[in-house]
């Protein structure tokens, strides 16, 4: 179960927005707050550990999951082309 | 079978640029993080670039970074490695290379190319 | 930097134990990577212990603790080649970049 703390926008900048999200999740042993269909949820903790994002399936049904190169985070891919990227801190 | 065939190396003066080319076939171009490994004469293997499925997000070895830039074209299923200001120490065979379940890291490579000779002199 | 020994002989039959320890801890595992003179790159495991289905069974991958080895079980003649390993490493300026050992040179007695 999970609940979401706070949530800044920010849409200063032209055809961006920049969204700032907190969660708190009540997780069993062994998993840990994370990203499911877009939504905040408790996901294996393991996933976290070992930065393979897209195994939490972060993005909603019909988008493609993309790993950042460095690991910080992944993208969001809509069919229609439009990139959402979520980093991770 | 995957095949990636690289193109575009030969002989290069010191400062100038070249472009790279690896097509890709035998797999899903779109669905998988490509990048670039080079190995000098005589010399072990060096990480070049690597770049994501979408094409949004790349990353440089330090040798190259700021003179490099890694792109895609997933119609044509052909990676892209632009180098410029080309120094003798570039010299090397540049192998493309494909990232295993969807992403790449230099401990989940499962196919190479053959690789393209670049030599840099005057 | 990845450390990995120079070389390493066996004789046919024998097994063949070619070690890598360094790089970062970025849970993708360990690369091994074997060269033939004059020939790309050919993957023989990837992701610690995960092997191409075009790559014999002799071939296999183990990690304990921060040491991570490649064996070759029943050495055969063709298996004689530099062996490289691949990791990550982690810097703040670049993030995880690809980093390979200098290669083992496997020599069949």
């Known amino acids: 179960t999970c609940e979401i703390v706070t949530l800044d926008r920010d849409s200063s900048q032209p055809r961006r927005t920049i969204a700032r999200q907190t969660a708190r999740c009540a997780c069993r042993k062994g998993q840990i707050a994370g990203t499911t269909r877009a939504r905040p949820a408790c996901v294996d903790a393991r996933i976290i550990k070992t930065k393979q994002w897209c195994d939490m399936l972060p993005c909603l049904e019909g988008e493609g999951c993309d790993l950042l190169i460095n690991r910080s985070g992944w993208t969001c891919t809509q069919p229609g082309g439009r990139i959402k990227t979520t980093t991770v801190s | 079978a995957v095949t990636l065939d690289e193109s575009g190396g030969g002989l290069q003066t010191p400062g100038g640029a070249l472009r790279l080319s690896c097509k890709a076939s035998?797999?899903?171009?779109?669905?998988?993080?490509m990048g670039w490994v080079r190995q000098a004469p005589g010399k072990g293997l060096e990480w070049v670039s690597a770049?994501?499925?979408?094409?949004?997000?790349?990353s440089y070895g330090s040798a190259v970074k700021g003179r490099a830039t890694i792109s895609r074209d997933n119609g044509q299923s052909t990676l892209y490695l632009q180098m410029n200001s080309l120094r003798a120490e570039d010299t090397a065979v540049y192998f493309c290379?494909?990232?295993?379940?969807?992403?790449?890291?230099?401990?989940?490579?499962?196919?190479w190319g053959h690789g393209t000779e670049v030599i840099v002199s005057s | 930097a990845l450390t990995q020994p120079s070389s390493v002989s066996a004789n046919p039959g024998e097994t063949a134990r070619i070690t890598c320890s360094g790089g970062?801890?970025?849970?993708?595992?360990y690369g091994w990577y074997q060269q033939k003179p004059s020939s790309a790159p050919l993957t023989v495991i990837y992701?610690?212990?995960e092997r191409p289905s075009d790559i014999p069974s002799r071939f296999s991958g183990s990690s304990s603790g921060s040491t991570h080895t490649l064996t070759i079980s029943g050495v055969q003649a063709e298996d004689e080649a530099v062996y490289f390993c691949g990791n990550d490493d982690y810097s703040s300026d670049s993030g995880y970049v690809g980093v390979f050992g200098a290669g083992t040179t496997l020599t069949v007695l």
């Open positions: 992701k610690d212990s």
């Open positions: 290379a494909k990232g295993s379940a969807s992403y790449i890291t230099a401990a989940t490579i499962d196919a």
């Open positions: 035998g797999f899903t171009f779109s669905s998988y993080q």
């Open positions: 970062a801890s970025s849970g993708y595992g």
């Open positions: 770049i994501n499925k979408s094409g949004s997000d790349t």
